[in-house]
């Protein structure tokens, strides 16, 4: 009986010789559980596992803890890969996180963190980031030290309010913090002075809601 080849991330797929960007099946570490992910095999050497993407507002990101845990949306369009998979993947290996951003004026920028991982569910998928470089701000728009993840039904922020309900979307809210890439999607010319938009403060400032975002990870030793 032939053993099925499994891949834990898009870097392994790339190294296996499959170098076309698209949807691939990944397998949870030490498990047979599978998840479908978009692999970007073109950006900066390829091998990137996309864990979040926004582009047109077609998917509702105001979701429950369970939905953010398991993932939602379509890897061909807007989606969230799933906190549980990302946590398991990044806890066993050193990963970098690249956040690619587009504004409504035709500019692009990125933030690259040289080490990224999520704690487990027992720690509310707390985000850990070090080593910021890139063009989307010299200061991290994800609050440091990392915050716990919050959703509309699981409030783990440091605010007297409930950030996820106020700003919409699940995110690593502080109180509430300089970013929220899972906020409400606003179209062009309606994307400024927004209290709950797609925000990356240290690139575009306050109240500016972005056109497109992609969060992607790759092993540091790729």
């Amino acid at each position: 009986k032939e053993e099925k080849t499994t891949f834990r991330d898009c870097a392994e797929i790339f190294k296996s010789g499959l170098t076309t960007s698209g949807i691939y099946t990944l397998t949870f570490p030490n498990s047979t559980e599978e998840v479908k992910a978009y692999c970007d095999m073109d950006m900066g050497g390829g091998g990137w596992t996309v864990i979040q993407h926004r582009e047109d507002g077609s998917v509702d990101f105001q979701r429950t803890w369970k939905e953010y845990k398991e993932g939602f949306g379509s890897p061909l369009g807007e989606y969230w890969l799933g906190n549980e998979f990302v946590s398991q993947l990044t806890s066993g290996h050193r990963y970098v996180l690249k956040i690619q951003l587009k504004d409504w004026e035709g500019s692009e920028a990125h933030s690259l963190y040289e080490h990224f991982y999520l704690s487990g569910e027992e720690s509310n998928y707390r985000i850990h980031l070090t080593g910021l470089t890139g063009t989307a701000g010299k200061i991290s728009s994800i609050s440091q030290p990392g915050s716990d993840f919050s959703t509309k039904d699981s409030d783990n922020d440091k605010c007297i309010c409930k950030c996820s309900q106020m700003l919409t979307g699940g995110w690593w809210f502080d109180a509430c913090g300089p970013s929220n890439l899972n906020g409400q999607y606003y179209p062009q010319k309606q994307n400024t002075n927004k209290f709950n938009g797609i925000k990356w403060y240290y690139w575009k400032g306050s109240g500016y809601s972005l056109k497109a975002t992609t969060m992607m990870i790759r092993p540091a030793d790729f």
Epitope: K158, C159, I160, C161, M166, D174, N193, K194, F195, S206
Partner: nanobody, 129 residues
């Protein structure tokens, strides 16, 4: 749509006074805090004063304490900044900005700059003889 419009800026001599207005639309002041900020040429934007209309709480930067007074008229959905004893170093573009009043860290009284998501276009204040 949320909109903030500042007015009242102008040229004033040192020691003089001005009253800036910030007219808000698209939301009610009851649920928001309004901050006044200023930016001088070549300098970072800095907080000057802020008010939470619901509780009447106010904040002032040390550099303007005793000289500036912030107030609000909720019936007009407008916040005012009365500036007395003006100095040349007060010369700047003055902006008002809004933040949902509840967006406060446990134990804190006021908001970091990045929490203010709605901004006006600014009004220029020049203090010169």
């Amino acid at each position: 749509d949320v909109q903030l419009v500042e007015s009242g800026g102008g040229l004033v001599q040192p020691g003089g006074s001005l009253r800036l207005s910030c007219a808000a639309s698209g939301f009610t002041l009851d649920d928001y805090a309004i901050g006044w900020f200023r930016q001088a040429p070549g300098k970072e934007r800095e907080g000057v004063s802020a008010i939470r209309s619901s509780g009447g709480s106010t904040y002032y930067a040390d550099s303007v304490k005793g000289r500036f007074t912030i107030s609000s008229d909720n019936s007009k959905n407008t916040v005012y900044l009365q500036m007395n004893s003006l100095r040349p170093e007060d010369t700047a573009v003055y902006y008002c900005a809004a933040v949902p009043a509840g967006r406060l860290r446990f134990g804190e009284q006021w908001y970091p700059l990045y929490e203010y998501d709605a901004w006006g276009q600014g009004t220029l204040v020049t203090v010169s003889s």
